[in-house]
Amino acid sequence: LPAQVAFTPYAPEPGGTCRLREYYDQTAQMCCSKCPPGQHAKVFCTKTSDTVCDSCEDSTYTQLWNWVPECLSCGSRCSSDQVETQACTREQNRICTCRPGWYCALTKQEGCRLCAPLRKCRPGFGVARPGTETSDVVCKPCAPGTFSNTTSSTDICRPHQICNVVAVPGNASMDAVCTSTSPTRSMAPGPVHLPQPVSTRSQHTQPTPAPSTAPGTSFLLPVGPSPPAEGSTGD
């Protein structure tokens, strides 16, 4: 004879457990049905009647099989510096991610709690580490023989052009100027970009001479909040 299938609610065997998509109701002392994603328990089970499920109301959701009395509220609408990458439905919460040119400074379980604009490196400095969805741009001073004349979140330091005869030597924020119109080796005229998962926010500025040096290792430091800095400019 085939084994009998127990229909919910049913009393589990002593020491036994309820099946998949069922839960043990302490009050009824029975195995009862869970509600599917997008629904919640409107009426809990008894010894003689199973769980009664109902659809989640607008702006609420349940993502898993459950027996919660109320659906979870979807998160607040995405802020102006965010884009909604997943809408609020009866089965999933809204997910907000940072818009292009921004990164997530404070993450939450899904999506981002706080976005911040990607920093840009000023002339004389290039991008040492590009921004990602969750980390800011890191700048570095352009090494001797290289320069950056832009304020950009993507431009790296690029080599000075090599001249037969130098009219104006290059520095960290300016390319060399040759007397001849045909240098022996000329780099591409435009700035060199690092690939990023977020869009470029590059703007050209007047060159600002800055000291240059070779790139090096990093210093181990903690992250923390800063008071508003209103420091003086560079040399």
Partner: nanobody
Amino acid sequence: QVQLVESGGGSVQAGGSLRLSCAASGHTYRSNCMGWFRQAPGKEREGVAAMYTGTDWKYYADSVKGRFTISQDKAKNTLYLVMNNLKPDDTGVYYCAADFGFICGYDSDDDPYDAWGQGTQVTVSS
């Protein structure tokens, strides 16, 4: 707890010397640029000195060139500022900061996600 802790401040006569230290502790990350800011009463915060780790690149404000020296001990994870020939104008609260603002090559100073210390008071009397 994440912290940058300054020490070495105090009161000194004009012409005297002090050495400020900045020790990093807590959850750490790799920072390229370290520096010192100061703020005198009623004045804006001023960048004093900065350096990129492992390079020759250093920045000094015009007002401290030739008198102040920035350095670091990577083994101790500590940044220093040696201040010689101190002047009354050097009085203020000195802050240690990491990977911050304009003097480290960024286009602005208004980034609230960088590391800052609580500051140490330096008073120079004539």
